[in-house]
């Protein structure tokens, strides 16, 4: 898995006059990190383990970029044309990664109303639209708002690249917490299913960094990937992560199955309960 | 209909400088896309060369990074390759093409690298 | 950078069969920076499928591409003469943009 840097700032218009202030969330590794409290115009670490990652130093940075952004962004949304009474959102999602063998990618994407319309790859600068004939029209007018000042926009966004991925190295750098090895809780439960079946659910938890392997294994074989069920590996909120993988067995072989899980060079197995 | 043209000498005395010019119709090489190098030595596969953008960006392969220049000129709808240095390896043929995912390429170019 | 690795190095059919070439990368690329090419001796490749799914102008409907993440798929359905040559993977995730080392597709 990358490291990744990722962040979602929304501005909005209510009737064409686009309102002051914005809305933004930072996530680092899939993690909630930072948000914009628009009460006290200040960049705010999410959590405890978001306080950690940068130890005691201050959110000035963060708070200036977001501004900043913010700033940019409700300018973009003052030249799309086609705002109509009503209230409007202009969302901007950006997102830099730095992978295990240390390459660098960058993109970020633009929603009108929720619905994508612009995609850019910041390092090749390859720009992207979506078929409807809504997106081509809302990318154009920002495509031309973005080229009206082409030297500056060319300097904003392999800056924005830069500061991305220096920012991101930074946390990387400067935290233990991002470097940590946290081995998961593993819990397995079991259910009744129909008659003769029960089921079985392997639970991971509270662990990182997020990969991780989670398998059920009959007689020490893993199980084929279409008789198991995974879960999505999700943010637990504390920094950590959590996930599962359910399959069904006939009810007297529980003894057969084990869950098999690998992580951060330690494995572990864990029988079914009787 | 957007066509791409390349020339420049067809031989090249080795560390001597290989120049190309791509001549672009009917597309302004400053509206959009990354305008591309790529060779094909004899006998052997794609290997991409370097981009200038729309937006006059430059991007090369690390590969030659070193002995590589992409330039442009807007005023004549062109961009050009320059290679210096060059060996017997650089012998290939050398095609323009426009974008990322490579819609339009001209023709190619021999260019033979011999003394 | 990002390599590509292309199986099989050739492949000898008959027209009519169906031929499934493969395009493996180092990694994972985002399939709308992934493309096809075919390419016929003395002349320039050409863009078969786009955005790793997408037919390019002209191109008949039994090519088709699909994949994700690092491993990716051309197939066509049903073979024609005109369709052997060499055919090529590329990304445009990164720099440098790379090709795969080529599939010839010959007549068996």
């Known amino acids: 898995e990358p490291h990744s840097l990722r962040y979602n700032l929304t501005v909005l218009s209510w009737d064409g006059s686009v309102q002051s202030g914005f809305l933004a969330e930072v996530h680092l590794d899939g993690q909630p990190f930072l948000r914009y409290d628009r009460q006290k115009c200040r960049a705010k670490p999410q959590g405890q383990w978001a306080e950690d990652v940068l130890g005691n130093k201050t959110w000035d940075r963060e708070t200036r970029d977001l501004t900043g952004n913010g700033k940019d962004l409700r300018m973009t949304l003052a030249h799309i044309k086609d705002q109509k009474e009503g209230l409007h959102s202009l969302q901007e999602i950006r997102v830099c990664e730095i992978h295990e063998d240390n390459s660098t990618r960058s993109s970020q994407h633009f929603y009108y109303d929720g619905e994508l319309f612009l995609s850019q790859n910041v390092e090749t600068e390859e720009w992207t639209v979506p078929q409807s004939s809504r997106a081509q029209t809302l990318a154009m007018n920002v495509r031309n708002f973005l080229k009206e000042d082409a030297m500056k926009t060319k300097t904003h966004y392999h800056a924005m690249h830069a500061d991305c991925l220096q920012e991101l190295r930074r946390y990387l750098e400067s935290s233990v917490v991002l470097r940590r090895r946290v081995p998961p809780m593993v819990n397995v439960t079991r259910s009744e299913a129909s008659e003769g079946n029960i089921t079985v659910t392997c639970r991971a938890s509270s662990f990182y960094p997020r990969n991780i392997t989670l398998t059920w294994r009959q007689d020490g074989v893993s199980l084929s990937h279409d008789t198991q069920q995974w879960g999505d590996v999700l943010p637990d909120g504390n920094g950590t992560y959590q996930t599962w993988v359910a399959t069904r067995i006939c009810q007297g072989e529980e003894q057969r199955f084990t869950c098999y899980m690998e992580h951060s060079g330690n494995h572990s197995t864990h029988p079914v309960p009787s | 209909q957007v066509q791409l043209q390349e020339s420049g000498p067809g031989l090249v005395k080795p560390s001597e400088t290989l120049s190309l010019t791509c001549t672009v119709s009917?597309?302004?090489?400053?509206?959009?896309?990354?305008w591309n190098w790529i060779r094909q030595p004899p006998g052997k596969g794609l290997e991409w060369i370097g981009f200038?953008?729309?937006?006059?960006?430059?991007k090369y392969n690390p590969s030659l990074k070193s002995r590589v220049t992409i330039s442009r000129d807007t005023s004549k709808n062109q961009f050009s390759l320059k290679l210096s240095s060059v060996t017997a390896a650089d012998t290939a043929v050398y095609y323009c093409?426009?974008?990322?995912?490579?819609?339009?390429w001209g023709q190619g170019t021999t260019v033979t690298v011999s003394s | 950078e990002i390599v590509l690795t292309q199986s099989p190095a050739t492949l000898s059919l008959s027209p009519g069969e169906r031929a499934t070439l493969s395009c493996s990368a180092t990694?994972?690329?985002?399939?709308?920076?992934f493309h096809w090419y075919q390419q016929k001796p003395g002349q320039a490749p050409r863009l078969l499928i786009y955005?790793?799914?997408n037919l390019a102008s002209g191109i008949p409907a039994r090519f088709s591409g699909s994949g994700s993440g690092t491993d990716y798929t051309l197939t066509i359905s049903s073979l024609e003469p005109e369709d052997f040559a060499v055919y090529y993977c590329?990304?445009?995730?990164?720099?440098?943009?790379?090709f795969g080392q080529g599939t010839k597709l010959e007549i068996k």
């Open positions: 093409a426009r974008g990322y995912g490579f819609d339009y």
């Open positions: 009917g597309y302004s090489i400053t509206s959009d896309y990354a």
């Open positions: 200038v953008s729309y937006s006059g960006t430059t």
């Open positions: 990694s994972s690329i985002s399939s709308i920076y």
């Open positions: 955005r790793t799914s």
């Open positions: 590329q990304q445009g995730t990164t720099i440098p943009f790379t």
